[in-house]
């Protein structure tokens, strides 16, 4: 099985024990590590931060002692914006220039492939996204002719039904991608006005339309029905939780909220907590399991957080095995307890290790 793990370059800027550089990663933990994110500048792939090149080097040095590890560079992301991607993909010359710039950049910096993180193609971009993928793959095939190992091509796709329908021609893009990471998280957020888990495995008992689509099982099944081969589908598992501030004394699923949860000490983003911050939060918190959805949530005071733990990730891995998927994807290594100092197990990357162990179990 593949274990595809994202590393985010901005994690270097977190304070103190939250600061994560690629040399802190475990070279034997994942089969693939994807560096997020690269930029596109003047229609050429480019670093996002000036210092990225140093971090590329740190990451790719991990392969010195684990030659089986593959590294990919992810281009795009939330800050890049869909419009910029759209402009490049829809213009034949810009697209060509971009595609041509990719192999030398990846080779120079020691990457084994490219991950496309166009978040998200609009309805009018659907065909252009397909063309971009098809032409990128053709370039990779051509570039590998002189006996080089062919560069890998993957894409991170939304798990939301509405986005899947408008953005992707699943059957066509699947032909050209080496694997597809489906982002089966962020199904529920503060915009809903109530508490809810952002990455449930199954549909909740109360879930009516459109909530019945907002779970991992539905998203995976839908992708498969649309023509994604199970052998190329990698299922996303988050090492972060989504938090809310409760608006009343109600604390269960569906309780009213006044907004996102308070920012974490290190990640400093309202409504989001890294797993290592959740481990801190759990001291003195009340933990519940949403039985049907097979995921936990915890409450403390007026704070509510839905997250994944070692038990829930094992359930998710069992599920992906049952569906004969290609493996699991983790967002992100730097949000797991990468130092092993927060979650009291004296184990680095406890969630990702639990995923790895479950994938290896017979």
């Amino acid at each position: 099985y593949k274990l595809v793990c994202y590393y985010t370059s901005w994690s270097q800027y977190r304070e103190g024990d939250g600061s994560c550089f690629p040399d802190a990663l475990d070279r034997f933990l994942c089969t693939h590590i994807i560096y997020s994110f690269a930029n596109i500048s003047n229609d050429h792939i480019d670093t996002w931060e000036w210092n990225d090149v140093t971090l590329y080097g740190m990451l790719n040095t991990l392969k010195n002692r684990n030659p089986n590890l593959k590294t990919l560079l992810s281009v795009g992301g939330w800050n890049f914006g869909s419009q910029r991607f759209s402009k490049i993909a829809s213009n034949t010359q810009s697209r060509r220039t971009f595609i041509k710039s990719v192999p030398p950049f990846l080779r120079t910096h020691g990457f084994d492939g490219l991950d496309l993180a166009w978040l998200y193609p609009g309805r009018r971009d659907k065909q252009h996204f397909t063309t971009l993928i098809k032409e990128m793959k053709a370039e990779f095939i051509k570039e590998a002719q002189p006996g080089k190992k062919q560069l890998l091509l993957s894409a991170a796709l939304s798990a939301g039904k509405v986005t899947i329908d408008s953005s992707y021609d699943i059957a066509k893009i699947s032909q050209h991608l080496d694997f597809i990471s489906i982002m089966t998280y962020d199904f529920h957020g503060a915009w809903r006005g109530t508490t809810g888990h952002h990455s449930p495995l199954f549909r909740g008992q109360e879930d009516a339309s459109p909530d019945r689509f907002s779970n991992t099982d539905y998203a995976v099944g839908y992708m498969l029905r649309l023509g994604a081969p199970a052998s190329k589908l990698v299922m996303g598992i988050p090492t972060f939780g989504r938090s809310f501030t409760l608006a009343s004394s109600e604390t269960g699923v569906g309780a009213p909220i006044s907004g996102p949860g308070i920012p974490g000490r290190f990640t400093k983003e309202a409504g989001t907590l890294a797993y290592y911050e959740i481990c801190d939060f759990l001291r003195g918190a009340t933990v519940h399991r949403i039985l049907g959805q097979q995921v936990p949530y915890a409450t403390k005071g007026n704070q509510w957080v839905g997250y994944d733990d070692q038990e829930s990730v094992k359930s998710k891995v069992q599920y992906l095995k049952d569906r004969q998927l290609a493996g699991a994807m983790v967002w992100a290594l730097d949000l797991d307890d990468f130092q092993g100092s927060f979650c009291g197990q004296d184990l680095r990357f406890p969630l990702t290790n639990a995923i790895k162990d479950a994938l290896a179990a017979t």
């Epitope: 270097q12 800027y13 600061s19 550089f21 500048s41 003047n42 050429h44 480019d46 670093t47 000036w50 210092n51 990225d52 090149v53 140093t54 971090l55 590329y56 080097g57 740190m58 710039s101 030398p104 950049f105 080779r107 120079t108 910096h109």
Partner: antibody, heavy 117, light 107 residues
């Protein structure tokens, strides 16, 4: 083998202009940021300017902002520094440098710029 | 701008001595601190980057440590070829800035 060869230095009067060039070889030029660093006679190192591999972003020290312009021609593997409104305090050896992220991993041998009347 | 302050500005040492040079940043620069060696009439040479990573080909007697605002370059056993001027440089943010240098002389 990485090679960086600077040219264009010389004597110029205050208020004058000069254009430095740096011919690069031995690496994929367009994939790396480049920098200019200077060193006044008997003094320490001073970073002057930097440009990303794509040429899409440029950065300058406050002391040269608005007077110096860094540019590159990736098709010619050449880095440039256009220096206008030169002052006596710009007198220095100017090094062309290849950056590897935040660090400068290769340096040219430098070209001397003297600003004097 | 981030100010970089090196100490001492010069030191005298003998071959075989353990030498320590410190560099202090005016604000936190995480691990983005590099060290260079420069000999008279020559271009500088990168020794250590990102606080502690030894540049390829640099002898293991050189080491770096620190994080945040305080950093150290250590030469465990000074060799004749190590007599030179050493500079620290922050690459946390632009404009990049160098320390004023530390000259290591023969005692």
């Amino acid at each position: 083998e990485v090679q960086l060869v600077e040219s264009g230095g010389g004597l110029v009067q205050p208020g004058g202009s000069l254009r430095l060039s740096c011919a690069a070889s031995g690496f994929t030029f367009s994939s790396y940021g480049m920098s200019w660093v200077r060193q006044a006679p008997g003094k320490g190192l001073e970073w002057v300017s930097a440009i990303k591999g794509s040429g899409g972003s440029t950065y300058y020290a406050d002391s040269v902002k608005g007077r110096f312009t860094i540019s590159r021609d990736n098709s010619k593997n050449t880095l440039y520094l256009q220096m206008n409104s030169l002052r006596a305090e710009d007198t220095a050896v100017y090094y062309c440098a290849k950056t590897y992220g935040g660090e400068i991993d290769y340096w040219g041998q430098g070209t001397l710029v003297t600003v004097s009347s | 701008d981030i100010q970089m302050t090196q100490s001492p500005s010069s030191l005298s040492a003998s071959v075989g001595d353990r030498v320590t040079i410190t560099c202090r940043a005016s604000q936190s620069i995480s691990r983005w601190l590099n060290w260079y060696q420069q000999k008279p009439g020559k271009a500088p040479k990168l020794l250590i980057y990102a606080t502690s990573t030894l540049q390829s080909g640099v002898p293991s007697r050189f080491s770096g440590s620190g994080s945040g605002t305080d950093f150290t370059l250590t030469i465990s056993s000074l060799q004749p070829e190590d007599f030179a001027t050493y500079y620290c440089q922050q690459s946390y943010s632009f404009p990049w800035t160098f320390g004023q240098g530390t000259k290591v002389e023969i005692k």
